[in-house]
């Protein structure tokens, strides 16, 4: 028979022959022959291969280096890599999460729109009219100005994006 020029899914062409690829979690030891199936071996401890493959070496699991602020979010298996995330108060500098930086704080006049996660930084927004923030924080949202009216008080000093209004007693006219 004519040797194949293309092979089925999960196969590869070698020596004019279609051989089965090794399944995820296993590496190639020896190609198939006309008489023998592809020889595969499971990846060792701390190794993985996540696709059907003909790799002769498994990949090492990622190391979550605590010196870079990293910790294990999900332990790797023979078929998956380890997933790292950052320690509390820190977030990844890239999608691959190879190192961490401290969460950014929102300055006075800005509030937290979205609290940081292990993979994303704090998102700040300017406090709109009627709201303020007088602290630098990675958690605090813009607070609404105090409503003097509900306390039966009047505004003595207008609020800004950094300060609350100052309320005071109403001037009462004598009879």
């Amino acid at each position: 028979p004519e040797p194949p020029t293309a092979c089925r899914e999960k196969q590869y062409l070698i020596n004019s022959q279609c051989c089965s690829l090794c399944q995820p979690g296993q590496k190639l030891v020896s190609d198939c022959t006309e008489f023998t199936e592809t020889e595969c071996l499971p990846c060792g401890e701390s190794e993985f291969l996540d696709t059907w493959n003909r790799e002769t070496h498994c990949h090492q699991h990622k190391y979550c280096d605590p010196n870079l602020g990293l910790r294990v979010q999900q332990k790797g298996t023979s078929e998956t890599d380890t997933i790292c995330t950052c320690e509390e108060g820190w977030h990844c500098t890239s999608e691959a999460c190879e190192s961490c930086v401290l969460h950014r704080s929102c300055s006075p006049g800005f509030g937290v729109k979205q609290i940081a996660t292990g993979v994303s930084d704090t998102i700040c927004e300017p406090c709109p009219v009627g709201f303020f923030s007088n602290v630098s924080s990675a958690f605090e949202k813009c607070h609404p100005w105090t409503s003097c009216e509900t306390k039966d008080l009047v505004v003595q000093q207008a609020g800004t994006n950094k300060t609350d209004v100052v309320c005071g007693p109403q001037d009462r006219l004598r009879a």
Epitope: N15, S30, D31, C32, T33, E34, F35, T36, E37, E39
Partner: antibody, heavy 117, light 110 residues
Framework: EVQLLESGGGLVQPGGSLRLSCAAS????????MHWVRQAPGKGLEWVAV????????YYVDSVKGRFTISRDNSKNTLYLQMNSLRAEDTAVYYC??????????WGQGTLVTVSS | QSVLTQPPSASGTPGQRVTISCSGS????????VYWYQQLPGTAPKLLIY???QRPSGVPDRFSGSKSGTSASLAISGLRSEDEADYYC???????????FGGGTKLTVL
């Protein structure tokens, strides 16, 4: 440890029959093709037959076609060679060997077949 | 007579380099890989070289194989007394639909 162990050899008269066995251990027998190779006393190696991992393909050297049959029982991890109509020129040490893309990478110690009256 | 042709004997002194040739045709060596086997006295053959020039783990790098056209050769450098053995080349033959061996070369270390 990967091992092949042949048995069944002995003295047989011309025209007689003999069945050789090769017991495999230490590897996934059902994934490998297997060969029989023989060596007449003081002579070189001669390939005799091969069988694929699932028994679907069998090839023989011309001199044994129609007389010898290679077979396997994967549930018993055993390879066989049924030898009929034996001749004096079939006298040899018979080895079983494992097939691999690396060649015949594991060999048994051999079993002697003597065809004589 | 064997399909693959080898010299019946070869010899060398310790430390020397010796080469064993293996000649075939387009249906075997010319179109398929060559394998070499070593058979020490009184023992079963052992795989020495596969796919023309690859060494299995455990085989010293003193042993090397090569192929050109329809011929192949095995080279042994730094010859040792324990290398004294019979050496066989082998290849699949497309015409015969079977494996063929050379007649073997008896290597003597003087």
């Amino acid at each position: 440890e990967v091992q092949l162990l042949e048995s069944g050899g002995g003295l047989v008269q011309p025209g007689g029959s003999l069945r050789l066995s090769c017991a495999a251990s230490g590897f996934s027998f059902s994934s490998y093709g297997m060969h029989w190779v023989r060596q007449a006393p003081g002579k070189g190696l001669e390939w005799v037959a091969v069988i694929s991992y699932d028994g679907s393909k069998k090839y023989y050297v011309d001199s044994v076609k129609g007389r010898f049959t290679i077979s396997r029982d994967n549930s018993k991890n055993t390879l066989y060679l049924q030898m009929n109509s034996l001749r004096a020129e079939d006298t040899a040490v018979y080895y079983c060997a494992r097939d691999s893309s690396r060649g015949f990478d594991v060999w048994g110690q051999g079993t002697l077949v003597t065809v004589s009256s | 007579q064997s399909v693959l042709t080898q010299p019946p004997s070869a010899s060398g002194t310790p430390g020397q380099r010796v080469t064993i040739s293996c000649s075939g045709s387009s249906s075997n060596i010319g179109s398929n890989y060559v394998y070499w086997y070593q058979q020490l006295p009184g023992t079963a053959p052992k795989l020495l070289i596969y796919r023309n020039n690859q060494r299995p783990s455990g085989v010293p790098d003193r042993f090397s194989g090569s192929k050109s056209g329809t011929s192949a050769s095995l080279a042994i450098s730094g010859l040792r007394s324990e290398d004294e053995a019979d050496y066989y080349c082998a290849a699949w033959d497309d015409s015969l639909s079977g494996w063929v061996f050379g007649g073997g070369t008896k290597l003597t270390v003087l």
